[in-house]
Amino acid sequence: PLATIPVSTTSLTSSEGSTISTPSVDISTPVTTSIVGDQCSRCKNGGFWDGLKCQCLTPYYGESCEEVVNSIDIAPPETVSAQMELTVTVTSVKFTDELKNHSSQEFREFNKTFTEQMNIVYSGIPEYVGVNITNLRLGSVVVEHDVLLRTKYTPEYKTALDNATEVVKQKITKVTTEQIMTNDNCSALMCFNTTGTQVQNITVTQYDPVEECRQKAEEYEDYFLVEYRDQKPYCISPCESGFNASKNCNHGKCQMSQNGARCLCVTTETHWYSGEDCNQGTQKSHHHHHH
């Protein structure tokens, strides 16, 4: 939808002044020829003939895969997540061997109570999804578990998840400090050993639209860039219109080459155009310049 369809014109002149017929092929672009059966097709840039037409590889398009697209689809995940590996020590339950068996009644009951307790602890965190016990061991019950966080992808997702992990740390520290045994008895849903609370590891989803854009642009990586619209990243070349980085070719057509974007200027019946942005018009009959 964002790719610009080439406009047919009488002839196009590059900003250097030479006349080029369309569709134009940059001589610096590597050319490969794909042959299938008796059909010889000039499918360039790694494209292949499927029997009817050239199937082009990103970022190329066109009858012979000779043109470079103006935008490349990049799809960030809808949601991004973080996983925190935590350890807490529950003192209101005494460890038994049955707790090691995840299908036992003991484990299921412990899991239910622990999940209820953690849902209460983290209830104010919008990114909180749940907890997952990974291991239970002696002392009273040392609970190794994951706290799962999730949020919608935005350009600031890392900050959002980093903030959420900080709040998790604060909340678990608070509850394990406050909910402690008194006289060998627990009046809370669960009681903890304050010193047994540890954050072992934090893993955050890694998604970099700039990196994906550069990878997909291949040898044009230096000329494609990411711009955001409605919090969504777009991988565009300067030939894509409507963005901050868009190149204005005025009386001409923007084309990507391996040296970057350039303007191919239009020659009409009355004028020819030149200049880097095809903004210098010369009237054919009067040889008069308009700026």
């Epitope: 209101s92 005494k94 627990c186």
Partner: nanobody, 123 residues
């Protein structure tokens, strides 16, 4: 399926005694923990006493020295001996079970409950 049935409640005068029983079925009684809770009219349910499979017992401050919790694993039964009863002990008494060796007298920590038996202390 875990089933707990309480009995032994009734009307008793202040200073008197009662023995509550709880018959358990549907699980290995000797494992985990058993407890007694009570709920007075218009009040929240509160922990009274707890006994674990390892022999540990715990009591609410309000009943310490007056109530005794015990269990008979051979009979799958839990007991609560209540002495020196007071008017404020009037409540529905519930038996609760857990597969865990619990040290918690918070009702939310317990997942299996009986229907309760009424104890009224009045002159």
């Amino acid at each position: 399926e875990v089933q707990l049935v309480e009995s032994g409640g009734g009307l008793v005068q202040p200073g008197g005694s009662l023995r509550l029983s709880c018959a358990a079925s549907g699980f290995t009684f000797s494992r985990g923990s058993m407890s007694w809770f009570r709920q007075a009219p218009g009040k929240e349910r509160e922990g009274v006493a707890i006994i674990s499979s390892d022999g540990w017992t715990g009591y609410a401050d309000s009943v310490k020295g007056r109530f005794t919790i015990s269990r008979d694993n051979a009979k799958n039964s839990l007991y609560l001996q209540m002495n020196s009863l007071r008017a404020e002990d009037t409540a529905v008494y519930y038996c609760a079970a857990s597969f865990l060796v619990l040290r918690a007298l918070n009702p939310k920590a317990w997942h299996y409950w009986g229907q309760g038996t009424m104890v009224t202390v009045s002159s």
